[in-house]
Amino acid sequence: LAKNLEPVSWSSLNPKFLSGKGLVIYPKIGDKLDIICPRAEAGRPYEYYKLYLVRPEQAAACSTVLDPNVLVTCNRPEQEIRFTIKFQEFSPNYMGLEFKKHHDYYITSTSNGSLEGLENREGGVCRTRTMKIIMKVGQDPNAVTPEQLTTSRPSKEADNTVKMATQAPGSRGSLGDSDGKHETVNQEEKSGPGASGGSSGDPDGFFNSK
């Protein structure tokens, strides 16, 4: 059964991002995941971030210098911005963002949380706080071995959620997992509120249209 996975708050206070580890999720086809830029809280500095969908080697190196694919910018302290990823088997239109089953995909930020560091393309909280999400699509959390993993690149989508698909004729590349040290997110049913966000297109060819 399709589930709303536990939302991930993109904040340095989020205990899911454990030191030296990533946050791994095991979405099934049909699942949805919300990534949230929390709104400002009185008495606490607002954290500014740009989130990217990146290749595994970029996630490992904490570098978004090449082919940066912006998903969402957290620069609106007055709003809780909710960005929804839907792990969908087939995209309904020609610009569908499709992710293959049994592949890994990575989201991270190389911003450091300050406004001045918003556009940083190296290091940032990816390095200092290991704020990375690893999405292991259609995989069994008890049966994953790093050497069996490959990663492909998704194509574009023009809907309001990131559409994950098991078949991606336009995708290319076969790249392995990073270090295998990840924090697992609880995949219990959640009924998170709000409308969904979306993902990035791609002027530089990182994604491939069908």
């Epitope: 009185a42 500095p45 912006v70 969402v72 620069n75 007055e78 309001n160 979306g198 791609d202």
Partner: antibody
Amino acid sequence: QIQLKETGPDLVQLTQTLSITCTVSGFSLTTYNVHWVRQTPGKGLEWMGAMWNGGRTDYNSAFKSRLSISRDTSKSQVFLNMNSLQADDTAKYFCARLDYWGQGVMVTVAS
Amino acid sequence: ETVMTQSPTSMSTSIGERVTLNCKASQSVGIDVDWYQQTPGQSPKLLIYGASNRHTGVPDRFTGSGFGRDFTLTISNVEAEDLAVYYCLHYGSIPFTFGSGTKLEIK
């Protein structure tokens, strides 16, 4: 209740400086950002710049070095100053938190 | 800078109809797009932020969608009070940039 209110002149002479004050209530300038946007018949809505919660300012390069934004947090005020005004600077000037906007002040540049 | 191109420039619709307004970014902007409504003589009002998040108090007949370069604002069951100009805004990088607007007229 969140409010933003612009106060400034209706008329500014050609080549002179425009000064507008945005007074906010219901929120803190050290937590939220305030943007300046103007609306001209020819160009529609145009983002001019921002005073960010931490005190940093960013500007639209279209205004080159003519534009300056500052604030006084103790008075909950943000200031816009723009010099060397030309006829095409005639516009309605808004301050905004983006989720909430002031009513705007209509400024005419006259010779 | 990112250029936001809105289409159509203006459109006419009837009460109860469904309309779709478009905004295209010159480069990929993720979901960093707002939609604003400006009724005659008023300040702009935020409808949608982050491409599809509805602002507090906005009727659910207003729906935003899209990401990357293509964004839409859909108004289902148009009401007379929806007569306005609608603007999209890209806020993900400096300078923030507005589209030129779509004027919605009621027949």
